[in-house]
């Protein structure tokens, strides 16, 4: 057992059918030592009495709020929730596996520059009696400081039957620079609560590797006189870090016929305008890439040739 | 990356090109690795990122753009003269690098030489025969000392008497390897910014 | 104590469908995940499916993906294994499991797929 | 397909020391623990070992189990008649958890 915050304490049990548990004893929180009570939660059954109470912890019935009473007095209150070890390995029961980019991947994050400034979400199916806390460091034997604001649902989604929600949170790395060559990982850990079962989930990258920038800005197209070629032009993103010249990106350039069973001409290039040809009907598209090393693509900016 | 590119002529900056060659080849190096030693471990999550410069040469600090000079996190071990000697940069305007930005980037890559092809000989006795590293990648790093032009002085190959432990030798290799990458992108930035200025 | 006593094997032809059943006693049955295991004649044990305490999520083993349901019920306190388009190979004694680091097995039922 | 790789088998004399080997790879037993079950002829599985050493009750002390990187061993010391069975190690990988991946089984003879 261990105290997850004031008042709150996790139990970690090995999670199988008729499983022995494991005891816990509870202090009352008083400088009382007599004619004190127990309770569970909005029971008024009496568990037991005296300044301490022993119970056998098995089972999500046998979580929950205790509370220490003195003549209809509340003295302290200590919240049991329960860890699930299931066959060795800690239950991922209120999270869902985002299988990207590989399976197991609970916590997802992003990056738009160099700047140690981050995003992680997660998705889940709950709706209700959830809670999460975030924290970071770089590096785990001595932690440099992350500072992470609080996780907020950002966005809810219809899969099939069930509703989906998506919830994110911001961190920023206390004293990042830009140029540095990370050698310790930024560490992710989420503790998630769902009514009376407590869970954790980590994550852990190089900023250089999360990295996705914005889609290029300004996307303009000038059409080239007496020719179907056009001068596409754009700029890179805002959030991208700068100096442009340090921290270069390339580009791709797609030309994609209104149907998506057309070929699509690809370019690539490190300038920040290339010529191709517009089809009718036709759209063309841009995204960008850390030039020197290849994390992830930025979403597409896109203009039609018309 | 693999993708078709139309790069731009590097123009009056020779390291430019050198430098795009190294990190193309030591990319390549490294998934290769990844691939041939798939039993072992030699991606990034598994490996110990170890930096054979550390304490010895100061890239990142020295070759640091201005722009940066402001932002406190990176001003840790600045040295603050500005360099004079140096073929890469021919006639082109210098003020705007630290003193020991290229001088740095040579020792890099003397150092890196030096551990690759100590690291060679040793995987030229394995029976396994498993692992070789790539003369491209080797020669990519001599080319670009040669554009350097520095002189400094040549560090002895390191020989050993004992029988080489293969296995840890190849997860040395992807250890180097990674962090060669992670310099070999610094130093392409740098020469990008030089050749900009 | 924990029990769990399995039912609907038998002998089927090749293509046709066969559910399996295993009914558990003696615990919280809808807080536990629960396996499919099965073992061919004179070979080894290969896992089939598992599904988690509250039937929300279902994982397969490649050689049934498709072709095999796993389900429970937890008010009856029962676990199924819908079996289609049955092949020749899937002959064998199929075990219902509990998860966990202690586990609890069926007896076993044949499922025999012959023409 | 069988990830973990046992002898198909092994045999000894009653009082002997009989060892299998279980060996697999980083994802599986260098990244989760190992079980061991003994399988009589016509029985369901039986559960000896779990979490790589730990003896569930009831399970006789002459059997050890242990892990080391990507190996896992099961030892039986002072074999008995009573113990010829077939062995199978189990592990999971951690890709595809919570599928089960067993080992490919090791029949235990005990010899005179």
């Known amino acids: 057992i261990w105290e997850l915050k004031k008042d709150v304490y996790v139990v970690e049990l090995d999670w199988y059918p008729d499983a022995p548990g494991e005891m816990v004893v509870l202090t009352c929180d008083t400088p009382e030592e007599d004619g004190i009570t127990w309770t569970l939660d909005q029971s008024s059954e009496v568990l037991g009495s005296g300044k301490t109470l022993t119970i056998q912890v098995k089972e999500f019935g046998d979580a929950g709020q205790y509370t220490c009473h003195k003549g209809g007095e509340v003295l302290s209150h200590s919240l049991l929730l329960l860890h699930k070890k299931e066959d060795g390995i800690w239950s991922t029961d209120i999270l869902k596996d985002q299988k990207e980019p590989k399976n197991k991947t609970f916590l997802r994050c992003e990056a738009k520059n160099y700047s140690g400034r981050f995003t992680c979400w997660w998705l889940t199916t709950i709706s209700t009696d959830l809670t999460f806390s975030v924290k970071s460091s770089r590096g785990s034997s001595d932690p440099q400081g992350v500072t992470c604001g609080a996780a907020t649902l950002s966005a809810e989604r219809v899969r099939g039957d069930n509703k989906e929600y998506e919830y994110s949170v911001e961190c920023q790395e206390d004293s990042a620079c830009p140029a540095a060559e990370e050698s310790l990982p930024i560490e992710v850990m989420v503790d998630a609560v769902h009514k009376l079962k407590y869970e954790n989930y980590t994550s852990s990258f190089f900023i250089r590797d999360i990295i996705k920038p914005d889609p290029p800005k300004n996307l303009q197209l000038k059409p080239l006189k007496n020719s179907r070629q056009v001068e596409v032009s754009w700029e890179y993103p805002d959030t991208w870090s700068t100096p442009h010249s340090y921290f270069s990106l390339t580009f791709c350039v797609q030309v994609q016929g209104k149907s998506k069973r057309e070929k699509k001409d690809r370019v690539f290039t490190d300038k920040t305008s290339a010529t191709v040809i517009c089809r009718k009907n036709a759209s063309i598209s841009v995204r960008a890439q850390d030039r020197y090393y290849s994390s992830s693509w930025s979403e597409w900016a896109s203009v039609p040739c018309s | 990356r693999n993708l078709p590119v139309a790069t731009p002529d590097p123009g009056m900056f020779p390291c430019l090109h050198h430098s795009q060659n190294l990190l193309r080849a030591v990319s390549n190096m490294l998934q290769k690795a990844r691939q041939t030693l798939e039993f072992y471990p030699c991606t990034s999550e598994e490996i110990d990122h170890e930096d054979i410069t550390k304490d010895k040469t100061s890239t990142v600090e020295a070759c640091l753009p201005l722009e940066l000079t402001k932002n406190e996190s990176c001003l840790n071990s600045r040295e603050t003269s500005f360099i004079t000697n140096g073929s890469c940069l021919a006639s082109r305007k210098t003020s705007f690098m630290m003193a020991l930005c290229l001088s740095s980037i040579y020792e890099d890559l003397k150092m890196y030489q030096v551990e690759f092809k100590t690291m060679n000989a040793k995987l030229l006795m394995d029976p396994k025969r498993q692992i070789f590293l790539d003369q491209n990648m080797l020669a990519v790093i001599d080319e670009l000392m040669q554009a350097l032009n520095f002189n400094s002085e040549t560090v002895p190959q390191k020989s050993s008497l004992e029988e080489p432990d293969f296995y840890k030798t190849k997860i040395k290799l992807c250890i180097l390897l990674h962090a060669f990458r992670i310099r070999a992108v610094t130093i392409d930035r740098v020469m990008s910014y030089l050749n900009a200025s | 104590q924990v029990q769990l006593v399995q039912s609907g094997g038998g002998v089927v032809q090749p293509g046709r469908s066969l559910r399996l059943s295993c009914a558990a006693s003696?615990?919280?049955?809808?807080?536990?995940?629960m396996h499919w295991v099965r073992q061919a004649p004179g070979k080894g044990l290969e896992w089939v499916a598992f599904?988690?305490?509250?039937?929300?999520?279902?994982y397969y083993a490649d050689s049934v993906k498709g072709r095999f349901t796993i389900s429970r019920d937890n008010s009856k306190n029962t676990l199924y294994l819908q079996m289609k388009s049955l092949r020749a190979e899937d002959t064998a004694v199929y075990y219902c499991?509990?998860?966990?680091?202690?586990?609890?097995w069926g007896q076993g039922t044949m499922v025999t797929v012959s023409s | 397909s069988y990830v973990l790789t046992q002898p198909p088998s092994v045999s000894g004399t009653p009082g002997q020391r009989v060892t299998i080997s279980c060996s697999g790879g980083?994802?599986?037993?260098?990244?989760?623990?190992v079980k061991w079950y003994q399988q009589l002829p016509g029985t369901a599985p039986k559960l000896l070992i779990y979490?790589?050493?730990q003896r569930p009750s009831g399970v006789p002390d002459r059997f050890s189990g242990s892990k080391s990187g990507t190996s896992a061993s099961l030892a039986i010391t002072g074999v008995q008649a009573e113990d010829e069975a077939d062995y199978y190690c189990?592990?999971?990988?951690?890709?595809?958890?919570?599928?089960?991946?067993f080992g490919t089984g090791t029949k235990v003879t005990v010899l005179g």
């Open positions: 499991k509990t998860h966990g680091s202690h586990d609890n």
């Open positions: 003696g615990f919280t049955f809808s807080s536990y995940g």
């Open positions: 599904i988690r305490y509250d039937g929300s999520n279902k």
């Open positions: 980083r994802s599986n037993i260098g990244s989760n623990t």
């Open positions: 979490e790589n050493d």
């Open positions: 189990q592990s999971y990988d951690r890709g595809t958890h919570p599928a089960l991946l």
